[in-house]
């Protein structure tokens, strides 16, 4: 059982109130993480309440502002970027959302040294991105697709790229999917340690079918949002990378990164690229069947002015069981030699752990096994390997951070996070100074989150950089549900889940049941984190039990439960959702005429299929932003878990389970079908033709459109929305209002 | 017009140590790596090494590693080539030569070369 | 190292004629983009003289006579009508791994 902020005495009960829907709505209960924004081994910066731009050391314990809020405000800046000379700071200001990561901003130059702003040679408006050089105060930035260099701020640019084209030829910034389904970034340049070099990566997505949406606005006629966007067995964009020598860029000017030849032979992805040192660098590429990956290592060959890639450093990874790597392939951590590496894939087992590959994949050394996995490889020293797993007391759902020593054999393994504050602290992450002198711990729950300051070599709390004091006396008075994480064990399999209860909570009595799903491929709902957010109201305040379950195809349980839905999608994580609820049923307290089911993108489309599963379980379920047919989804996404819609892959698993086909079987059910006609990821398509199956089929289903809102249906329409699903739910489950 | 023009020939006992010049002219000098290949009497070509004279970065054969020395001075466009512990089969032609810009390790410009007879 | 192997050792041809001149070597000299392969004429008590790069690409002042092809391990230089100031030593060299290395050479002298 998961303990939360702990309560007060039943004599003060009556004093304390249930959660309200706007207390949700407000972020009332929200808390805050400090992430130290590291510039030295032992230095930080960080932006203080009234939005100064403080620098801390954290050896001689002194602090100071090196730009003022003064100087903030002047250009209404957002956000800052230090120099790594510390001689000038780039405000950003006008920012301008796009995509998931990428936006649009001005930026103006600060010079340190003298206190103005730099004039001469500014930058244009509006930049696509923009970053200073790894040392000194080198600018790279993106303006209309093309890359530009300036040696010093002042300096005029350099351009790079001249090919650079809206929405055909993209230099230095991923296209759409490559931004949401493979980079995860905003950015896709990456200079070399020292600055030396920056290699970019060349999108061409001139054959990319394009989605086009309108957009409604307050215009006479709408405009139309035109997307190159690959689908399922479409054209995918045209991936090369470049480096460039950004002391002499205009020498031999930008050198293409050969493609591993066995890349190379057929439709391939660009899945990543990490600087080893200025003059050696990695790639990893990725087959269109994405169970194959290449890494290759590249060295600088000044006698060519270009990079040999020579086959005896390519590394290939492949899966005989599933898709490569996890939700991505994972990167590679260098150690110190500048050749051997850290990379996080499957044991013999089938679990995610860190090997050491120092000549061949053939011959790598694992550093650790068992049955857990992983996570993540924070930092390589000289001495120790930081990482996250979820191995400990084999909760699936937390993570801590370990310590192993590599300076020593053989290598001994501590747990850093693991009794430090055991009740409170369970899922953490890890930020690291330079050199790993330093490093803060960020604790997500299930506790009242904390962020904490250690010596990296003692692994000594040094201070606590954010307790989230305020949230925790405003909790004092809120009667919170209970949590329990728990497993159920059907048919060899494990089903981890996360129980939210009603405060007063009693076994004896029967409770309406609200399953929240999101079931995607590598995902996990069950964690050890904590949150006060719209089922935390409906548990509080409605008295309603919410359950989340992670079943097959779920992450970080091996591979036998990830790989599970390999080609097989929408029928596992469904099923696996069913089961769970009639365990639920057979612990007593569900009432199982109230149960329901919600889910949001991948989740609105398991809920969907869950609803229509014909199993009587469910009385009604909201789906929202769902994916219909895997046919409207992003190629690189869809083909990593499905292969191809083609008569000789798997297309007819890709027709069998579309929410189209199972349109009949919504007539028994209440159905609430929500999406935002301005959804760049998953379309508005995908709701309209559910609405069109279930019209054709003559079933009566209820549904919201939100105009000109994405994805995440924020803003006012997050009000909205959810105002709008707990009225469903209530009425669904008869709960008075 | 490209110009390498190399000292004069030298006549050394075994043991001792020579230092060839070449010196550029009709381009930028730190642009360029500087190749040294020699020829012994009525054989073929052996690459020595490269190096390059605006990042200073240099390129030995294995087989020469520590006995062989190559610098440059910007400031007079000159490249030198220092071989030390001569034996008698170090007699041969020695050639400065520019790595042509395209080429990928072809050279483009040649000196006229430095006969170095090592003999007791 | 990489071994080149050229051959013949020597081609005894007329003025006019046609010279295929080989060279093969121990291991593949290219990448999926370029090829590490050069060739050079050089005359007696002359220093060599660059005629081909990277395997096909002819240098600048150099008579369209003379070609080159090939790729991986062998590659072939051809002059396609001998004129008399061909007859020479033509060397094959490879910038594909250190070091460097040349071949033996090929003499071509006048039949």
């Known amino acids: 059982i998961v303990l939360r902020p702990s309560r007060v005495h039943n004599s003060e009960e009556n004093t304390m109130r249930a959660l309200t829907l706007k207390d949700i709505l407000n972020g009332t209960f929200s808390y805050k993480t400090f992430f130290p924004n590291w510039i030295s081994g032992q230095e930080y910066l960080h932006q203080s309440a009234d939005n100064n731009i403080v620098l801390y050391n954290i050896e001689t314990g002194q602090s100071y502002t090196i730009l003022s809020n003064r100087t903030m405000k002047s250009v209404n800046a957002s956000n800052y970027g230090l120099s790594p000379d510390r001689q000038f700071v780039y405000l950003e200001s006008d920012y301008s959302k796009l995509w998931r990561y990428s936006y649009t901003a001005t930026y103006y130059i600060y010079d340190l040294s003298n206190g103005e702003f730099v004039r001469g040679n500014e930058l244009p408006r509006p930049i696509q991105y923009l970053c200073w050089s790894p040392v000194g105060s080198k600018l790279a930035y993106v303006y209309q697709n093309n890359i530009y260099l300036k040696q010093r701020p002042g300096d005029p640019p350099f351009q790079i790229t001249f090919n650079g084209r809206e929405n055909k030829i993209f230099n230095g910034i991923p296209d759409w999917v490559y931004e949401e389904e493979m980079l995860a970034t905003k950015y896709a340049l990456w200079w070399s340690p020292n600055g030396k070099f920056l290699a970019y990566a060349e999108f061409n997505d001139t054959d990319i079918p394009v989605i086009a949406y309108s957009y409604y606005g307050d215009e006479q006629y709408p405009r139309t949002i035109n997307i190159p966007y690959p689908k399922a067995g479409a054209k995918n964009p045209v991936v090369r990378i470049f480096i460039i020598d950004t002391t002499y860029p205009a020498y031999v000017g930008p050198q293409e990164v050969p493609v591993p030849a066995m890349i190379a032979s057929s439709d391939y992805y660009f899945s990543w690229l990490t600087w080893v040192t200025d003059e050696r660098v990695c790639l990893q590429w990725l087959k269109r069947v994405q169970n194959v990956s290449v890494l290759s290592i590249c060295d600088f060959r000044e006698d060519w002015q270009t990079w040999d890639c020579p086959k005896t450093q390519e590394h290939i990874e492949e899966s005989r069981t599933g898709w490569a790597g996890g939700f991505f392939v994972s990167t590679p951590v260098f150690s110190y030699d500048a050749i051997s590496y850290y990379k996080i894939f499957s044991d013999k087992d089938g679990y995610k752990h860190i090997h050491y590959i120092k000549d061949t994949v053939e011959n790598a050394i694992q550093i650790t096994s068992g049955k857990w996995e992983a996570i993540n490889i924070f930092r390589v020293t000289q001495d120790s390997l930081f990482y996250s797993s979820n191995e400990f007391e084999e909760y699936p759902g937390r993570r801590n951070i370990y310590r192993i020593s590599i300076g020593s054999y053989p290598p001994s393994k501590k747990c850093v996070t693991c009794h430090l504050r055991k009740e409170r602290c369970q899922y953490y992450t890890a930020s690291f100074s330079d050199y790993a002198k330093y490093y803060a711990l960020v604790c997500y729950g299930p506790g009242i989150p904390i962020s904490t300051l250690h010596d990296g070599r003692t692994d000594q709390e040094i201070k606590i950089l954010e307790e989230n004091k305020e949230l925790e006396n405003a909790l004092k008075n809120i009667q919170l549900p209970k949590e329990e994480i728990k497993k159920l064990e059907v048919d060899e399999i494990t089903l981890w889940y996360k129980m939210i209860l009603p405060p007063q909570f009693d076994r004896s009595k029967k409770y309406p049941l609200l399953i929240q799903v999101y079931g995607g491929p590598c995902s996990q709902s069950v964690r050890s984190v904590f949150a006060v957010n719209w089922i935390s109201y409906l548990a509080s305040k409605e008295g309603m039990v919410i359950a989340l379950v992670d079943g097959r195809g779920t992450a970080f349980q091996g591979d036998k439960l990830l790989y599970a839905v390999y080609r097989k999608l929408g029928v596992y994580e469904v099923e696996d959702q069913i089961t769970a609820v009639r365990k639920f049923i057979e612990m007593g307290f569900i009432d199982e005429k109230r149960i329901a089911i919600w889910g949001w993108s991948y989740g609105g489309y398991v809920s969907s299929l869950a609803l229509a599963s014909g199993t009587g379980l469910f009385k009604c379920g909201i789906a929202v932003a769902p994916v219909s047919s895997w046919e409207y989804y992003a190629s690189v996404y869809t083909e990593r878990f499905m292969g191809l819609p083609t008569k000789d892959d798997n297309l007819e698993h890709y027709k069998n389970s579309t929410v189209m086909a199972r349109a009949e079987y919504f007539r028994n059910v209440d159905y609430l079908l929500i999406h935002g006609t301005a959804d760049d990821n998953v379309h508005f398509q995908n709701s309209a033709q559910i609405a069109k199956a279930l019209v054709n089929a003559q079933v009566d289903f209820q549904a919201m459109w939100y105009s000109d809102q994405n994805h995440g249906l924020s803003g006012l329409s997050t009000n909205h929305l959810y105002t709008h699903m707990t009225h469903f739910l209530k009425q669904c489950f008869s709960l008075s209002d | 017009q490209v110009q390498l023009v190399q000292s004069g020939a030298e006549v050394k006992k075994p043991g001792a140590s020579v230092k060839v010049s070449c010196k550029a002219s009709?381009?930028?000098?730190?642009?360029?790596?500087i190749h040294w290949v020699r020829q012994a009497p009525g054989q073929g070509l052996e690459w020595m090494g490269w190096?390059?004279?605006?990042?200073?970065?240099?390129k030995y054969a294995q087989k020469l590693q520590g006995r062989v020395t190559m610098t440059t001075d910007t400031s007079t466009s000159t490249a030198y080539m220092e071989l030390r512990s001569l034996r008698s089969d170090d007699t041969a032609v020695y050639y400065c030569?520019?790595?042509?810009?395209?080429?990928?390790?072809?050279?483009?410009?040649w000196g006229q070369g430095t006969l170095v007879t090592v003999s007791s | 190292e990489i071994v080149l192997t050229q051959s013949p050792g020597t081609l005894s041809l007329s003025p006019g004629e046609r010279a295929t001149l080989s060279c093969r070597a121990s291991?593949?000299?290219?990448?999926?983009?370029?090829?590490?392969m050069h060739w050079y004429q050089q005359k007696p008590g002359q220093a060599p003289r660059l005629l081909i790069y990277?395997?096909?690409n002819l240098e600048s002042g150099i008579p369209d006579r003379f070609s080159g092809s090939g790729s991986g391990t062998d590659f072939t230089l051809t002059i396609s009508r001998l004129e008399p100031e061909d007859f020479a030593v033509y060397y094959c060299q490879q910038s594909r791994e250190y070091p460097y290395t040349f071949g033996q050479g090929t003499k071509l002298e006048i039949k």
């Open positions: 030569a520019r790595h042509g810009g395209t080429g990928r390790g072809a050279m483009d410009y």
């Open positions: 190096i390059h004279p605006g990042s200073g970065s240099i």
């Open positions: 009709g381009y930028t000098f730190t642009a360029n790596i």
């Open positions: 990277g395997a096909s």
């Open positions: 291991q593949s000299v290219s990448t999926s983009a370029y090829s590490y």
